[in-house]
């Protein structure tokens, strides 16, 4: 072990203050006591240390807490959080939502870094489930957070937390994720009346089964084409022309522009051409009149 340079006379830090920004690397190492730093972490953020000076301070904390920092220190890390590696963060036990908020604030405006992802993972695992307050906090900082979770992770989201979800939070979700979220949303919003219910449930409909879409078609909801295009193909296929017409209301005219895209293309192929003609949109590709349609899947189920 190389002998450390001694702190020059009169330079020993009595408190964490602005004067330390003029301390050289070796002076910070020699003159700032790690225990003092830990108790005055809240002051570090107010001092415009450079990244190299923050590196020195981090080394000090690492030596003081080799098993991981206590939450009292973590909560006040501020900019020093940007120095932490995912390996550092895995040693932490973060239980307070205030701590989580304080650290997310430091990273605000940036993409979710591996450090932040690790922090959130540690926090959620510590809580056992993704409760409403946590979800509120996470989606406020990272609108795409929900869609970054696996279907398995989403299964721990209680229905009550769904109230915190905004439409933009689901923009990048795939069908597997919406399959998990939709039943929770349906449960969460079940006591709302028709039009209010539809406004809330709309963003989750990419996970809705056929029977729910049929029920919605009876409620004059006027679903827009963007929502319709995100529906599960297997849920749309069994819908009749009349049901789709009721579901879309005045937006039904938009089907023409989407006739080559799923799920509209596949749905058209399953409809009788004369039924499609009743829409007056010029949709082509339906089953010609006089053809018999056998539902083989039904036959298989019976045999």
């Amino acid at each position: 072990e190389v002998e450390k340079t001694a702190c020059p006379s009169g330079k020993k830090a009595r408190e964490i203050d602005e004067s330390l920004i003029f301390y050289k690397k070796w002076e910070l190492e020699a003159c700032v006591d790690a225990a003092l730093l830990a108790t005055q972490m809240d002051r570090v953020n107010a001092i415009p240390f450079t990244y190299e000076q923050l590196d020195v301070l981090k080394h000090k904390l690492d030596e003081l807490y080799p098993q991981g920092y206590p939450e009292s220190v973590i909560q006040h890390l501020g900019y020093l959080f940007l120095k932490m590696s995912p390996e550092d963060i895995r040693k932490w036990n973060v239980t307070s939502l205030e701590t989580l908020k304080a650290l997310l604030e430091v990273n605000k405006g940036h993409e979710m870094s591996p450090q932040v992802a690790t922090l959130i993972d540690r926090f959620v695992k510590g809580r056992g489930q993704l409760d409403k307050d946590t979800l509120d906090t996470l989606t406020a900082f990272y609108p795409g957070y929900l869609c970054s979770l696996s279907p398995e992770e989403l299964s721990s989201v209680p229905p009550s937390s769904i109230w915190a979800v905004r439409p933009q939070d689901l923009d990048t979700c795939d069908p597997r994720q919406l399959d998990v979220l939709y039943p929770k949303a349906r449960l969460a919003f079940q006591n709302m009346n028709g039009s209010e219910y539809f406004v809330k449930i709309q963003s989750f409909l990419g996970g809705a089964p056929t029977e729910d879409l049929k029920a919605l078609s009876q409620q004059n909801v006027s679903m827009d084409l963007a929502t319709f295009m995100k529906l599960r193909t297997d849920a749309v296929l069994p819908l009749t022309v009349a049901e789709v017409q009721k579901l879309l209301g005045p937006h039904v005219e938009g089907l023409k522009a989407e006739e080559r895209h799923r799920p509209v293309r596949d749905w058209i192929l399953r409809q009788r051409q004369d039924d499609l003609d009743t829409l007056g949109l010029g949709l082509q590709g339906g089953i010609p009149n006089g053809y018999l349609v056998l539902d083989l899947s039904m036959q298989e189920a019976l045999s």
Partner: antibody, heavy 117, light 107 residues
Framework: EVQLQQSGADLVKPGASVKLSCIVS????????MHWVKQRPEQGLEWIGS????????KYDPKFQVKATITADTSSNTAYLQLSSLTSEDTAVYYC??????????WGQGTTLTVSS | DIVMTQSQKFMSTSVGDRVSITCKAS??????VAWYQQKPGQSPKALIY???NRHTGVPDRFTGSGSGTDFTLTISNVQSEDLADYFC?????????VGGGTKLEIK
């Protein structure tokens, strides 16, 4: 007086590797950070990366992560920059610089590297 | 990554004049900015550190100001030996980044 003495100019062939050195006098490199900076003819400065010799911890600009390796030998008080798979794009003057934690207070005289067949 | 922008590539001034060179950071870098001077054929030299502190031996006609995202290097009473390139550099976070430089020409 602090001095950073860099190795002499080098002419190397494309595809080869080169190791530039920066010998430091009048201070202990473990008490500082050592940086490397690239400057191509008539162009600005580009930070390549740095090393904390006391903790043997190097950091790089992602752009140079594959190209450059920064090391330090505390016994000889020397910092090194190794550049691999050289191309004409690597033709430049390379500077080492010392930082006490907040700016580059001393610079080497620069090493001119020419990559040509 | 933080981008440092020096919008003036060239500036022309006369001996005795006062000139201000600006540098803008793409995000808040607090006061962790340094200014460097590079004369033709020489290595860069430090002028200002932590936005407003003069490096040892730098004449007091060089002053630095600013914090956050906007920084200025001011040279009052410009001398002929000030003909050089001037660079700002942020020391706030990795990777360090340097402004494109401003070449000061003396009329």
């Amino acid at each position: 007086e602090v001095q950073l003495q860099q190795s002499g100019a080098d002419l190397v062939k494309p595809g080869a590797s080169v190791k530039l050195s920066c010998i430091v006098s009048a201070f202990n490199i473990e008490d500082t950070y050592m940086h490397w900076v690239k400057q191509r003819p008539e162009q600005g400065l580009e930070w390549i990366g740095s090393i904390d010799p006391a903790h043997d911890n190097a950091k790089y600009d992602p752009k140079f992560q594959v190209k450059a390796t920064i090391t330090a030998d505390t016994s000889s008080n020397t910092a090194y920059l190794q550049l691999s798979s050289l191309t004409s794009e690597d033709t430049a003057v390379y500077y080492c610089a010392k930082s006490d934690g907040f700016y580059f207070d001393s610079w080497g005289q620069g090493t001119t590297l020419t990559v040509s067949s | 990554d933080i981008v440092m922008t020096q919008s003036q590539k060239f500036m022309s001034t006369s001996v005795g004049d006062r000139v201000s060179i600006t540098c803008k950071a793409s995000q808040n870098v607090r006061s962790a900015v340094a200014w460097y001077q590079q004369k033709p054929g020489q290595s860069p030299k430090a002028l200002i550190y932590l936005a407003s502190n003069r490096h040892t031996g730098v004449p007091d006609r060089f002053t630095g100001s600013g914090s956050g995202t906007d920084f200025t290097l001011t040279i009052s009473n410009v001398q002929s030996e000030d003909l050089a390139d001037y660079f700002c550099l942020q020391h706030w976070n990795y990777p360090l980044s340097v402004g494109g430089g401003t070449k000061l020409e003396i009329k």
